[in-house]
């Protein structure tokens, strides 16, 4: 079932800003970008060309089984989970200790769901009651997008615990959190 | 210059097999995700593969599943697409798609496309 | 399969003048983690590859003039362009890449009158 075939290793993306012959799409000097009628937003910069590259998002695959209450599917489902840091990353002073230290700065990058896939699994719950079936949206693929879209945090509560899990490093914030926050088949984990 | 140049089109009967390559060139081919997109004759666009930068994740249409299979070697630049059990509806134009390798995913640059005609 | 319905089929425009193309999507295609949504317009002049023009719902690709902008939110987009030109001519796709399988519109075939 679903689109993907699997297979048991990790996806580590770690691409090398400086051995571009061209700048990445989204480097290049596009004006219309910040336009009025682009919200406002720029585009994604996870670093600018002259950063140094901290750039790891992989894609891990995870099986597990959905649950609905008391009710489990019959078969394990697999999908991804999405792990590690984006950058940027710079090397800052510490007007403290004079020394120095790496501090991210910019846009909030974060490794994180950026494709779905359908999946529908057979639900079989105690007691005698008849199996059931459920549509469950997994997660396909990761990428290191900014979630600085957001004007209000809270509109991410329907990923719950998985929409806060901190990077490393970093202090989680708080996210509001919904009823259907634990419900397996929301958990879009990354 | 960014380059996809497809290659391995051609005239193949119904239950024949084909294999189509993408060349890559003018980026670091390994940090991209890959497409296949076909158009057959007259018509729309229609997806048809996804590959990760590994190749560790692929994804398929219902419409080619169990018949075709995405592959890559990163370390010849290289993206392909093996195509078994052919059908006259798989008649179409191939084109390879790259995706960007960070932030929005749409398919920033497109190859020129081969033909590929199933007949009898 | 998310469904792309895409109208019209055919818009015939005078040089000059504005053209809309709806796109309406069976589904959201808001990714809730990031807030993006994930639509893009592509255009495929005749005899061409096709090539990106807007992605994410609203934001021109390199090199894309601004005359061409995106809009919409939840299932229903819109691209605009507000004064048509000449070179404009060829069939305009949305797609959808919020879930696989990815799934284009039917395409919109812009001509001049």
């Known amino acids: 079932q679903g689109w993907q075939a699997f297979k048991n290793d990790a996806t580590e993306i770690i691409p090398e800003l400086g051995e571009y012959p061209e700048p990445p799409p989204e480097l290049e000097n596009n004006k219309t970008m910040n336009r009025a009628e682009n919200g406002g937003r720029p585009p994604h910069h996870p670093f600018e060309t002259k950063d140094v590259s901290e750039y790891s998002c992989r894609e891990l695959h995870f099986t597990r089984y959905v649950t609905d209450g008391p009710c489990r599917s019959a078969k394990p489902v697999t999908e991804l989970v999405c792990s590690g840091q984006c950058g940027p990353a710079r090397l800052l002073p510490n007007a403290i200790g004079r020394g120095k230290w790496w501090r991210p700065s910019g846009p909030d990058f974060r490794c994180i769901p950026d494709r779905y896939r359908a999946q529908r699994v057979q639900l079989l719950c105690p007691g005698g009651e008849a199996p059931r079936a459920r549509k469950v949206r997994l997660v396909a693929s990761c990428k290191c997008k900014r979630l600085t879209r957001f004007h209000n945090q809270s509109e991410l509560k329907d990923f719950g615990t998985e929409a806060a899990r901190p990077q490393k490093g970093r202090k989680p914030r708080p996210r509001a959190r919904s009823a259907k926050a634990n419900q397996a088949e929301l958990e879009n984990a990354y | 210059e960014v380059q996809l140049v497809e290659s391995g089109g051609g005239l193949v009967q119904p239950g024949g097999s084909l294999r189509l390559s993408c060349a890559a060139s003018g980026f670091t081919f390994s940090s991209y995700s890959m497409n296949w997109v076909r158009q057959a004759p007259g018509k729309g666009l229609e997806w048809v593969s996804y590959i990760s930068s590994s190749g560790s994740s692929i994804y398929y249409a219902d419409s080619v599943k169990g018949r075709f299979t995405i592959s890559r070697d990163n370390a010849k630049n290289s993206l392909y697409l093996q195509m078994n059990s052919l059908r006259d509806e798989d008649t179409a134009v191939y084109y390879c798609a790259r995706e960007r390798y960070y932030g929005d995913t749409p398919f920033d640059y497109w190859g020129q496309g081969t033909l590929v005609t199933v007949s009898s | 399969d998310i469904v792309m319905t895409q109208t019209p089929l055919s818009l015939p425009v005078t040089p000059g003048e504005p053209a809309s193309i709806s796109c309406r999507s069976s589904?959201?295609?808001?990714?809730?983690?990031?807030?993006?949504?994930?639509l893009d317009w592509y255009l495929q002049k005749p005899g061409q590859s096709p090539q990106l023009l807007i992605y994410?719902?609203?934001y021109r690709a390199s090199g894309v003039p601004d005359r061409f902008s995106g809009s919409g939110s939840g299932t229903d987009f819109t691209l605009k362009i507000s004064r048509v030109e000449a070179e404009d001519v060829g069939v305009y796709y949305c797609m959808q890449r919020i879930e696989f399988p990815l799934t284009f519109g039917g395409g919109t075939k812009v001509e001049i009158k």
């Open positions: 589904q959201s295609l808001l990714n809730s983690v990031d807030g993006s949504t994930n």
């Open positions: 994410t719902l609203s």
